[in-house]
């Protein structure tokens, strides 16, 4: 990445398309949910990030290479009754017309009698929606991410059975501290309450339907996180995700 412009703009929290390249580490992670190399584990001889081209490149069709952005699927279809299926997703009632991969397997409503098949690890996502709004919209959120990952997700529960969705107050970066000072004119210790600007949500992947219909399922959350980062690079995320991480051990400290 030769450009001084990109060196100056990297890691400033804003995605600059001119720097949104592998050489510039996707603008220092600004375009890729802070992940500087989603293809780090891809051992293909091809530069798979250059082959998101609406055609199948078998050398990139591995989990580590993000399944070639699912471009090798033989029967790539769109959900026929998308509005209906979105409205009835994960509502504990099986709608067979929605029980297909392209419709998100009706949020597993038709597979409640089947054993779960959890991928190893946890997806930890920061999204700029407050917890109450995210929980209210959780079915749409899980469906949107599941559509990108071609599998099903669920919100993880803690040891008490509570959903692991927590308020997110932002990073304590120098830029943000400065921003708070300029807008409030109060020393930090005088700030009565921190402002909730988003949510940190912990997700699990349940492959129980994916493994029946496909061989392109994520065995762990690492590649799933990387695939979401690649969608951020392409600008195809429908929710304001800020960062995505994968934790292969159970998170010890949720917040």
């Amino acid at each position: 990445c030769q450009s001084q412009y990109c060196a100056d703009k990297a890691r400033d929290g804003i995605c600059d398309e001119a720097c949104n390249s592998h050489a510039c580490q996707w603008d220092g992670g600004d375009c890729s949910l802070t992940m500087e190399d989603p293809w780090a584990n891809c051992t293909s001889t091809l530069r798979c990030w250059e082959y998101i081209n609406n055609q199948c490149d078998e050398q990139c069709n591995t989990a580590e290479c993000l399944f070639d952005n699912f471009e090798c699927q033989r029967n790539s279809k769109t959900c026929k009754y998308d509005k209906y299926c979105a409205d009835h997703f994960k509502d504990n009632h099986c709608d067979q017309g929605c029980n297909s991969e392209e419709c998100g397997w009706d949020g597993l409503d038709c597979a409640s009698d089947q054993p779960e098949n959890l991928a190893e690890g946890t997806l930890i996502i920061v999204v700029l929606l407050p917890p109450e709004q995210l929980l209210q919209d959780s079915r749409s959120f899980l469906r949107a991410l599941g559509t990108l990952l071609h599998t099903n997700l669920r919100i993880k529960q803690d040891s008490q059975g509570a959903l692991m969705v927590y308020p997110y107050f932002g990073e304590k970066s120098a830029a943000m501290k400065k921003q708070k000072m300029t807008r409030r004119s109060l020393p930090e210790e005088q700030e009565q309450e921190q402002e909730v600007i988003g949510s940190k949500i912990f997700l699990e992947i349940d492959n129980r339907q994916c493994v029946q219909d496909s061989d392109q399922c994520f065995k762990n959350t690492d590649a799933a996180a990387a695939l979401l980062a690649s969608h951020a690079i392409q600008g195809t995320l429908s929710y304001p995700l800020v960062s995505v991480f994968s934790e292969l051990e159970s998170p010890r400290n949720a917040q």
């Epitope: 412009y5 703009k9 400033d12 929290g13 804003i14 995605c15 600059d16 398309e17 001119a18 949104n20 600004d30 375009c31 700029l128 929606l129 709004q133 932002g170 970066s173 830029a175 943000m176 400065k178 921003q179 600007i197 988003g198 600008g235 995320l237 304001p240 995700l241 800020v242």
Partner: antibody
Amino acid sequence: EVQLVESGGGLVQPGGSLRLSCAASGYTFSSYGMSWVRQAPGKGLEWVSYIYPYSGATYYADSVKGRFTISADTSKNTAYLQMNSLRAEDTAVYYCARHSGYYRISSAMDVWGQGTLVTVSS
Amino acid sequence: DIQMTQSPSSLSASVGDRVTITCRASQSNRRFLAWYQQKPGKAPKLLIYGASSRASGVPSRFSGSGSGTDFTLTISSLQPEDFATYYCQQYYISPLTFGQGTKVEIK
């Protein structure tokens, strides 16, 4: 309904200061970038500055760098443009405009305010 | 900075005419180009983004094409409400830059 409403314009002398406000409603304010764009009387559009409210990161046009400061208060869903050392050539209608892509300056401006007139004259 | 040059700067046309406005960038901005419509005393309105995608609520008579450095806005059949000034804008790299505008007037 997504809406942006500017205020704070007016007549100011050369060298003076003014602060413009842009109140946003109908969407998650911190998720989308915001720009100020100006239009001198009878002229075309000129981009002035950009902020991503979530991170507070900012960009400026060279013509205003060092004189103008963009900021955002996510608790008030409002973006600001603090204009110092004003010159006659800063006279324009100032619009705030929301960017359509989360955290991307590289996205089109899909919602615009009605504009507020700033006149710099002695 | 990327300079954006529109042509023509003004044109006269009649209702029903097909109108084409071109925009040339001084360097490639891939497809990171938008078109806006502005009527006197009003704020600009987004018509086209990504060089060819219509913004929501924009009539199908408006279409955009091009990539790299050369872009076109076409109004297939001019309607009375289309008489306005049109601006192209690149959003590939900061500073964001606009064309000088094309005024579409009634013949």
